[in-house]
């Protein structure tokens, strides 16, 4: 019997300072290239090693970015979203949605990593 997969969704405001090579992440999504079915939102697809986002540590691959400096990212073409980030200035405020997967196993199920027994 398989456990049910639930998601814990949280939101966070992340303030990044643009580094020498930029903000340090990649995005996917947009109205013209949906990354998630029926969702044209903008998602983080890669955190670059030693980039501003990686050094800050809060932004994660898979996070949905809801806004940049207060500007909503809904219904944007992919390239328009890229341009918005590129022109966001030195101090960049991101409103992000983290989606944490929570595995709910059946009662009495012991996970493989359970040290007991």
């Amino acid at each position: 019997m398989n456990g049910r997969v639930d998601y814990l969704v949280t939101e966070e405001e992340i303030n990044l300072t643009r580094g020498p090579s930029g903000l340090g992440f990649n995005i996917v999504g947009g109205t013209d290239q949906q990354y998630v079915s029926n969702d044209s939102g903008i998602y983080v697809s890669r955190i670059k090693e030693n980039g501003a986002a990686a050094l800050d540590g809060r932004l994660q691959e898979g996070d949905k970015i809801l806004s940049v400096n207060g500007q909503d990212l809904k219904n944007l073409l992919h390239q328009d979203a890229v341009d918005l980030f590129r022109n966001a200035g030195y101090a960049v405020s991101l409103r992000v949605q983290h989606r944490l997967q929570v595995q709910n196993g059946p009662i009495g199920h012991r996970g493989e990593g359970d040290p007991s027994g």
């Epitope: 090579s21 992440f25 990649n26 995005i27 890669r46 390239q79 890229v82 980030f85 590129r86």
Partner: nanobody, 127 residues
């Protein structure tokens, strides 16, 4: 091992055109970002143009926008740089560079530190 070989450089007069080619081998280059950089005598190497496969996105430096065009032929594993209305300040060694592209678009300007593989360069001189 990835190898890049540039060709097409030469000596031309201001206002002329040149087309540079970069032939790549050792990889499946439809899934690589490919770019041109240049280095003028006594200056640091600078970004010229990039073609990123994942979103069919091209970027240009402000100094070449409207004059240079980057394109690629994945069947031939070749990337081109069409340079029109050349100026003396375009004189430099032009390098082809590539890196394995990642999903999505970088929100940052292209940065040469991301590029894993470089050609030997081809000299362009505009008099």
């Amino acid at each position: 091992e990835v190898q890049l070989v540039e060709s097409g450089g030469g000596l031309v007069q201001a206002g002329a055109s040149l087309r540079l080619s970069c032939a790549a081998s050792g990889g499946t280059f439809s899934s690589y970002a490919m770019a041109w950089f240049r280095q003028a005598p006594g200056k640091e190497r600078e970004f010229v143009a990039e073609d990123s496969w994942s979103n069919h996105r091209v970027w240009y430096s402000d100094s070449v926008k409207g004059r240079f065009t980057i394109s690629r032929d994945n069947a031939k594993n070749t990337v081109y740089l069409q340079m029109n209305n050349l100026k003396p300040e375009d004189t430099a060694v032009y390098y082809c560079a590539t890196y394995r592209d990642y999903s999505g678009s970088t929100v940052d300007p292209p940065n040469q530190s991301e590029y894993d593989y470089w050609g030997q360069g081809t000299q362009v001189t505009v008099s």
